[in-house]
């Protein structure tokens, strides 16, 4: 978002085109109330930053978040009998990038056809409430299951009906929360015309009056609590998982649970790195040097770091992969175009010479009991 | 060089209009803006609109239903139209040049142009 | 509607002079201040832009300082061909010029 210029002589600057134009002179419009930008905001607005890179990055986004999250939530929900905390935490991560994901034609068009946004106003505050939701929600549902893991090698005991009620009384508390700190981006106008480029945008740009104080404190205010704070208790989880790890036992079966345990905090270190830390970093940068300069220097960074950001609903399957024995399956035979009845018959003759599943998979495998760290 | 050439003098009675003509050399419209301001005798100056290169028009609210601001771009030439003259309209008017953007200044004006409204 | 105050409304001073003109603005408006002369019969002509920003051709005893509220030109030693009158015009919100600044010779 970029500061943008009230040229109306009186009111608010949160209208950007009010009702769209009052008449039409020659071959342009006469606009009521106007947003200008400054020369670099117009350069990166047109450029083949935000019209051919954001797309190629969605698209690619589109591809893998929709069919792996789909699979996914379908797994957790339909084919994972005993629905364990890790379980109800992915599925609601798996719906939180769905929910985000199933916008992004929208997004895609919005970007290649020049940041023009022919939606309407309510379509584009839902994907921008949902784009910035699915942030929050995949944050706080990554610490739920960070804590968790490390919680299940502290008390390696069986599941319980009372643990997954308080996972489903948390994830129910964490949307409540998210539906509450993106209210402000839901009733805030986004859809602003801007005359000298002839195009309306999503949020791109914001009205200069609403963005001096109140967008950099609710983003740093997001950033301290709903970004830092779990990305705190993330790294504790995962400092002390290691710790753990390090003096358990070693044996063939622990081994892989320790290698598996690994790739899983790499894989959330890398969607941190990647997706969360730039991202919430640049927020609150970026609407810092608006607030005290009155332009960004950082808006080519901050359209980036936010694209990246969406890049956490691509990485989530590889979570669920490392953590979920039934959705590791299910992917496995996906990309082998196998279904799992069909392997499931076949192991049916070794499964008398392997060790039980019952002892030996990971967590949140159906028929689990023991952990898998 | 970049330059703005503006029509003579006018003088209007009541109620009537006035077109002012301002032709762009040097550059073009299709890439700048161009502004109108306009200066009572001994008074400061004002702004009263502007039209894009893409055609997009603003127009200040004291006289926005008065002003029409038009561009030919065959012939590189903007206009401001400006209707129900009383004789408060009794100003010199201005254009000038604007590339559009919020960081920049209004940088080549015209000569002006003396609308004399006047029953 | 953004107001701005030019003071003094005149300034009366001899060449070779240091001439200090104020523009202030009644609400924040960063570095989006720009600075006219204007002599008698003539159009405006601009001299700084963007608070700080030197137009072409403008000789360098003009500057320009300030931002958010307060802004100033200042001519370091006034030539005979500076006297004039300066308007400010601010572009953060909407086009508002000063009332104006006569500098006029002692």
């Known amino acids: 978002t970029i500061q943008g210029t009230n040229r109306s002589s009186k009111g608010r600057s949160l209208i950007g085109k009010v009702d769209g134009t009052s008449h039409v002179t020659g071959k342009g419009v006469t606009v009521e109330t106007v947003f200008s930008v400054d020369e670099f905001s117009a350069s990166v607005l047109t450029g083949k930053l935000t019209t051919v890179f954001l797309p190629i990055v969605y698209t690619i986004v589109f591809v893998v978040g929709l069919p792996s999250n789909g699979m996914a939530l379908w797994v957790f929900l339909f084919r994972t009998k005993k629905k364990h905390p890790a379980v109800i935490y992915m599925a609601n991560l798996a719906l939180a990038d769905l929910l985000s994901v199933i916008w992004f034609p929208l997004k895609i068009a919005y970007h290649i056809h020049g940041n023009n946004w022919i939606y309407g106003e309510a379509l584009c505050n839902v994907l921008i409430g949902f784009f910035y939701g699915n942030m929050y929600c995949s944050i706080l549902f990554m610490t739920c299951l960070s804590v968790q893991r490390y919680w299940v090698i502290v008390n390696p005991m069986g599941h319980s009906r009372k643990k997954a009620n308080i996972a489903i009384g948390i994830s129910l508390a964490i949307w409540l929360l998210i539906l509450l700190v993106t209210i402000p981006l839901y009733v805030v106008k986004q859809t602003i015309f801007i005359p000298a480029l002839n195009i309306t945008t999503c949020h791109d740009v914001l009205p200069e009056q609403l963005l001096v104080g109140d967008m950099f404190n609710y983003f740093l205010s997001l950033a301290i609590g709903v970004f830092l704070f779990p990305a705190f208790l993330t790294a504790s989880a995962y400092v002390l998982m290691i710790r753990m790890l390090r003096s358990s036992a070693m044996d063939e079966n622990s081994e892989k649970k320790r290698k598996r345990a690994i790739k899983l905090i790499v894989t959330v270190l890398a969607m941190y790195l990647i997706c969360f830390t730039p991202s919430n970093l640049l927020l609150v940068v970026h609407y810092f040097l608006i607030k005290s300069q009155g332009q960004s220097h950082v808006y080519a960074l901050y359209i980036v770091a936010l694209c990246l950001s969406t890049l956490n609903s691509c990485i989530d399957p590889f979570v669920y992969y490392f953590v979920s024995h039934d959705f590791r399956d299910h992917a496995k035979n996906a990309l082998l175009c196998r279904s799992v009845r069909t392997v499931k018959q076949m192991q049916v003759s070794l499964t008398s010479k392997k060790h039980s599943r019952k002892s030996s998979s990971y967590s949140s495998s159906s028929t689990t009991v023991k952990t898998s760290y | 060089q970049v330059q703005l050439v503006q029509s003579g003098a006018e003088v209007k009675k009541p109620g009537s209009s006035v077109k002012v003509s301002c032709k762009a050399s040097?550059?073009?419209?299709?890439?700048?803006?161009v502004i109108w301001v306009r200066q009572a005798p001994g008074q400061g100056l004002e702004w009263m609109g502007v039209i894009w290169g893409n055609g997009n028009t603003y127009y200040a609210q004291k006289f926005q239903g008065r002003v029409t601001i038009t561009a030919d771009e065959s012939t590189s030439t903007a206009y401001m139209e400006l209707s129900s003259l009383r004789s408060e309209d009794t100003a010199v008017y201005y254009c000038?040049?604007?590339?559009?953007?919020?960081?920049?200044?209004?940088?080549?004006w015209g000569q002006g142009t003396l609308v004399t409204v006047s029953s | 509607e953004i107001v701005l105050t030019q003071s003094p409304a005149t300034l009366s001073l001899s060449p070779g002079e240091r001439a200090t003109l104020s523009c202030k603005a009644s609400q924040n408006i960063y570095k989006y201040l720009d600075w006219y002369q204007q002599k008698p019969g003539q159009a405006p002509r601009l001299l700084i832009y963007?608070?700080?920003s030197l137009a072409t051709g403008i000789p360098a005893r003009f500057s320009g300082s300030g931002s958010g509220r307060d802004f100033t030109l200042t001519i370091s030693s006034l030539e005979p061909e500076d006297f004039a009158v300066y308007y400010c015009l601010q572009h953060n919100s909407g086009w508002t010029f000063g009332g104006g600044t006569k500098v006029e010779i002692k």
């Open positions: 040097g550059f073009s419209l299709s890439s700048y803006g």
């Open positions: 000038a040049r604007w590339r559009g953007y919020k960081d920049y200044p209004f940088d080549y």
């Open positions: 963007n608070a700080n």
